[in-house]
């Protein structure tokens, strides 16, 4: 009968969920030592604390392997929710962006926030502006008082994701023509001037709308 009692008591002790994966366990404090590949985690519930043996550490903790015993250690990285090691975050707190294992409220220069994953990814790299082009109107450099001059810049490196926009790569400004009157020329008829003005405006809008030289978003085309 004594044997039967010991067996049943041992069975209930092993089946107690708090003791799962333990090498030594008590009803009050839970595990104090874990099986080889498991991580020891000290859980706090109000005033009480007890040990658990887990396959992976909970959010906010990372698995620290040691010869005596593997333990769950708290992430000490600022604004980090869960981490891979003591100095590498894998998920930041709400409102912060993950970048190279750290959490930022704004992505560093050259990186752009990817809202769906709250990560900083390589952004769009643009070159220097070209010089302003010739002041012209309706493809003419004379015959008007005012014209438009345009400048452009290259996309040097495309963004990692299509959802990341590049800065403007073409811009125009009003300019004063160097020659108000064309030598021996006539003024452009008003209707033609209007048509050409619309055409040029459309071209500039299209250039500004594109956020990459050869990028996939194609908002202008879809």
């Amino acid at each position: 009968q004594g044997n039967r009692w010991r067996r049943s008591k041992r069975a209930s002790y092993v089946s107690n969920p708090i003791c799962k994966g333990c090498l030594s366990c008590s009803k009050d404090n839970g595990c104090s030592r874990c099986q080889q590949k498991l991580f020891f985690f000290l859980r706090r519930e109000g005033m009480r604390q007890y040990g658990e043996c887990l396959h992976s550490c909970p959010s906010g903790y990372y698995g620290h392997r040691a010869p005596d015993m593997n333990r769950c250690a708290r992430c000490r990285i600022e604004n980090c929710d869960s981490c891979f090691s003591k100095d590498f975050c894998t998920k930041c707190k709400v409102g912060f962006y993950l970048h190279r294992g750290r959490c930022f409220d704004e992505c560093p220069d050259g990186f752009a926030p990817l809202e769906e994953t709250m990560e900083c990814v390589e952004g769009c790299e643009v070159g220097h502006w070209s010089e302003w082009g010739t002041c012209s109107r309706n493809n003419r450099t004379c015959g008007f008082k005012w014209g438009l001059e345009t400048r452009t810049r290259q996309i040097v490196k495309k963004p990692v994701k299509d959802t990341i926009l590049c800065p403007t790569i073409a811009e125009s400004r009003r300019c004063k023509m160097t020659m108000r009157h064309c030598p021996g020329g006539k003024r452009t008829p008003k209707a033609k001037e209007k048509r050409n003005k619309k055409k040029k405006r459309k071209l500039i809008e299209r250039a500004q709308e594109q956020h990459s030289v050869f990028l996939a978003t194609d908002r202008a085309n879809q």
């Epitope: 070209s130 010089e131 082009g133 452009t152 290259q154 996309i155 050869f214 990028l215 085309n221």
Partner: antibody, heavy 118, light 110 residues
Framework: QVQLKESGPGLVQPSQTLSLTCTVS????????IHWVRQPPGKGLEWMGA???????YYNSNLKSRVIITRDTSKSQVLLKLNNLQHEDTAMYYC????????????WGQGIQVTVSS | QPLLTQSPSVSASLGASVKLTCTLS???????IEWYQQHPDKSPKFLMQ??????SKGDGIPDRFSGSSSGAHRYLSISNLQLEDEAIYYC?????????FGSGTQLTVL
């Protein structure tokens, strides 16, 4: 491995439409932009246009009214249509892949010789 | 749109050095350009991308090939010329939704 291969007719009659296919392997058309470039005999390279990884298209303004580039991602193919062919459209036609992040052509097809003649 | 100017032909002796020039239209002197090499009856091959300050080469391009810049000029330098360097060299440039090639320079190795 990454490859591009052009296919289509070698001979087309003037005023007809040229249809060329660029079949790609080793990468996805939804990740890369594909361009068409041609080279008339003894002359330099001329950029014709491109289909973006997002599906949009851009063309050389000198050819704009005559050229159409489309793609079929399920077949990994990019198609070039050039209508109202003239003798000066006789050229070697290449498709080329644009590098993922930088704007240059990192992989080229072997090219296909197209002759416009009656 | 940018224009690229290249001299039609250059010749140099085997083992010597040569410098090919590609000139951007002055408005675009800050632009990156690319150099491509094309052997007879072969497809063009990417050599390098060249900015006004640095260059990055394609895979497997020998150290004999290098790039440099000065103002609107972009240079491709080849040292210790080999017979296999005999080819046409094109420069190319991207702008807003287009790509432009230079007319090409025929390099002859004597």
């Amino acid at each position: 491995q990454v490859q591009l291969k052009e296919s289509g007719p070698g001979l087309v009659q003037p005023s007809q439409t040229l249809s060329l296919t660029c079949t790609v392997s080793g990468f996805s058309l939804t990740s890369y932009n594909i361009h068409w470039v041609r080279q008339p005999p003894g002359k330099g390279l001329e950029w014709m246009g491109a289909v973006w990884r997002g599906g949009g298209t851009y063309y050389n303004s000198n050819l704009k009214s005559r050229v159409i580039i489309t793609r079929d991602t399920s077949k990994s193919q990019v198609l070039l249509k050039l209508n109202n062919l003239q003798h000066e459209d006789t050229a070697m036609y290449y498709c080329a892949r644009e590098e993922l992040r930088y704007v240059y052509f990192d992989v080229w097809g072997q090219g296909i010789q197209v002759t416009v003649s009656s | 749109q940018p224009l690229l100017t290249q001299s039609p032909s250059v010749s140099a002796s085997l083992g010597a050095s040569v410098k090919l020039t590609c000139t951007l239209s002055s408005q675009y002197n800050t632009y990156y350009i690319e150099w491509y090499q094309q052997h007879p009856d072969k497809s063009p091959k990417f050599l390098m991308q060249l900015s006004d300050g640095s260059h990055s080469k394609g895979d497997g391009i020998p150290d004999r090939f290098s790039g440099s810049s000065s103002g609107a000029h972009r240079y491709l330098s080849i040292s210790n010329l080999q017979l296999e360097d005999e080819a046409i060299y094109y420069c190319g440039v991207s702008d807003v939704s287009l790509y432009v090639f230079g007319s090409g320079t025929q390099l002859t190795v004597l």
